[in-house]
Amino acid sequence: EDELQVIQPEKSVSVAAGESATLRCAMTSLIPVGPIMWFRGAGAGRELIYNQKEGHFPRVTTVSELTKRNNLDFSISISNITPADAGTYYCVKFRKGSPDDVEFKSGAGTELSVRAKPS
């Protein structure tokens, strides 16, 4: 079995303020079992943007049905983008663990830049 890779095809995405940003991510394998999460930034200070397993993220919608069997697409769309949303977003795969899930692999990141709203 080939080891799972986390693919973020775009190094950067530019979006006008007020629009939605699509951040693409997919896995090359269904194994190992475990949730994915999206973060802005890396390291200890990273900000959780979306957790597949739990939580309420009103500005985030998933592009695909994540509950669908054999789904490999974990792209998200963030609505009503503001300059404060700029940064690098990482799609991270976790391996199911007990009691806590363990970070398994991260995508290379997608840098979101925000353009001024067209007048």
Partner: antibody, heavy 122, light 108 residues
Framework: QVQLVESGGGVVQPGRSLRLSCAAS????????MNWVRQAPGKGLEWVSA????????FYADSVKGRFTISRDNSKNTLYLQMNSLRAEDTAVYYC???????????????WGQGTTVTVSS | EIVMTQSPGTLSLSPGERATLSCRAS???????LAWYQQKPGQAPRLLIY???SRATGIPDRFSGSGSGTDFTLTISRLEPEDFAVYYC?????????FGGGTKVEIK
Amino acid sequence: QVQLVESGGGVVQPGRSLRLSCAASGFTFGSFGMNWVRQAPGKGLEWVSAITASGGSTFYADSVKGRFTISRDNSKNTLYLQMNSLRAEDTAVYYCAKDFTEVVGWLGMDVWGQGTTVTVSS
Amino acid sequence: EIVMTQSPGTLSLSPGERATLSCRASQSVSSSYLAWYQQKPGQAPRLLIYGASSRATGIPDRFSGSGSGTDFTLTISRLEPEDFAVYYCQLLGSSPRTFGGGTKVEIK
């Protein structure tokens, strides 16, 4: 540069067999899913078959299932399409095409060969 | 099996005009799995748009894609002479990876 070159096309009688090859260069062939797509004269594109990067899974259009077999040799950077029991309706230009990302069939096919022509005629 | 239907079959326009091409799926699909290609006579297809709305590398920004669910659109904001070609949408993700029948954009 990234390149795909098909070969093996030709004129063949109905019921006979033909094997197409696609030689890849300029990218890590063994990391990407690959596809065969065909185009009958004056018609649109028809997806024929796909294979995962490792070769472990294959996919076929109903029109060729049971007659065509896709395979790959990652050590030779080559994709194959074995076509058996050929019919007149298989007459087409056959293109090989690379998946855009390492995720099979996710976002499209970003590199295409120039095609090889298969004519099935008695 | 999901059927992809493109319309119109032919679009007759002049250089500088806006082209709007439609692709409709017979049932709802994820936008991540919708691609658009351009094909010129005697040439292989070229990937234009992936994920319904993202331009492939090197594709001019006059090409844009939009849509979700069952209805998807490729827009060419201002036709250049080299844009007159046949355009195909494709559903990916599942098997078969169906193409639409194509829309020919021809010079009026």
